[in-house]
Amino acid sequence: STGAGSHCQKTSLRVNFEDIGWNSWIIAPKEYEAYECKGGCFFPLADDVTPTKHAIVQTLVHLKFPTKVGKACCVPTKLSPISILYKDDMGVPTLKYHYEGMSVAECGCR
Amino acid sequence: STGAGSHCQKTSLRVNFEDIGWNSWIIAPKEYEAYECKGGCFFPLADDVTPTKHAIVQTLVHLKFPTKVGKACCVPTKLSPISILYKDDMGVPTLKYHYEGMSVAECGCR
């Protein structure tokens, strides 16, 4: 996602499972910290946004032709799991310790 | 990058190394096909944009709170190498068959 003036960074995003309709199968937690990647991928791309060569190239092309080519985008580059309690198909409450890819660990410019 | 109405997809982006100032060290090719990921990550996210769970969650939160949370972003999810000819520190033209991460192979919503 892009943000007005700030550089690409990880920001808080509390997600309530009821808001997204997942409370029908996720029993707990009721909400969790998903985080969100926000901010712009501005020239020059800093090391902390771990740019790929393509992102660097696109940033340079955007600099030259801003109306033709977009900036690189600030996105999750590493995700972390959360633990959830859910009802399995037999209706039995089951703990999944590692429900993968649910929370942002790192953001970067891609 | 985001695009107005179209869905996230790979589009052509011809990059001339002179335009980005890399012609000082990349001898050949003079330009290459970098591709660009363009288009929106709209609900529901299709399988072909290989969404992560976090991207699905963010899309659902955006649907509920569009002004608070951004959509997932259409970015390169797989990159390909190109071959380049460059001059080494001895002035000898040298071929790098696999200069990694220079061209988009696949786009997705992240």
Epitope: - | S83, L85, L95
Partner: antibody
Framework: QVQLVQSGAEVKKPGASVKVSCKAS????????MHWVRQAPGQGLEWMGE????????NYNEKFKSRVTMTVDKSISTAYMELSRLRSDDTAVYYC???????????WGQGTLVTVSS | EIVLTQSPATLSLSPGERATLSCRAS??????????MNWFQQKPGQAPRFLIY???NQGSGIPARFSGSGSGTDFTLTISSLQPEDTAVYFC?????????FGGGTKVEIK
Amino acid sequence: QVQLVQSGAEVKKPGASVKVSCKASGYTFTRYWMHWVRQAPGQGLEWMGEINPSQGGTNYNEKFKSRVTMTVDKSISTAYMELSRLRSDDTAVYYCAIGSNYGGLVYWGQGTLVTVSS
Amino acid sequence: EIVLTQSPATLSLSPGERATLSCRASESLDNYGISFMNWFQQKPGQAPRFLIYAASNQGSGIPARFSGSGSGTDFTLTISSLQPEDTAVYFCQQSKEVPRTFGGGTKVEIK
């Protein structure tokens, strides 16, 4: 600066062998391919083959494959080209030259004249 | 093997004139967007000198009057304003495939 110094002129009889050396300096010897090119009197350039000093891998011109052997001695940064079963039409100046994996021959030795005569 | 044909065999021009040397390959020398074509200059009694590589790039210390162009199978070496010291034989060479091959050469003479 890069220097390739070749051994002196040789006179050989038909059927004999000749071994030309090329001593390299001014760069890391194992970094570039060493090529051998010959030039008969008043003629053009003829590529004989190349050797990668790093692991000793070779690519030979099919024309010379049965008669040529390219070797290196990394300890003294020297490349060798041995041509056997010499004929009168092997009379030529033999050059060593270095290039990268791209194959352009950037630096050349001064040449070694090999005369094959009975 | 790739055959390189150079023309003309001899070129006789006056100082200051423009020299255009041609090299035609029996198959394309392009790969990965790179042209595997090189040019060499050889003066009498000397080793060849690396002039142009990848069709259009000057070797180190090569005067600006030497330029190369072309792609695929047709390549040109241009000497924009001939100098007396440019009297030499010019060879094209392909480095795309083994065996690396040379053209037969073009002799440039100054009138």
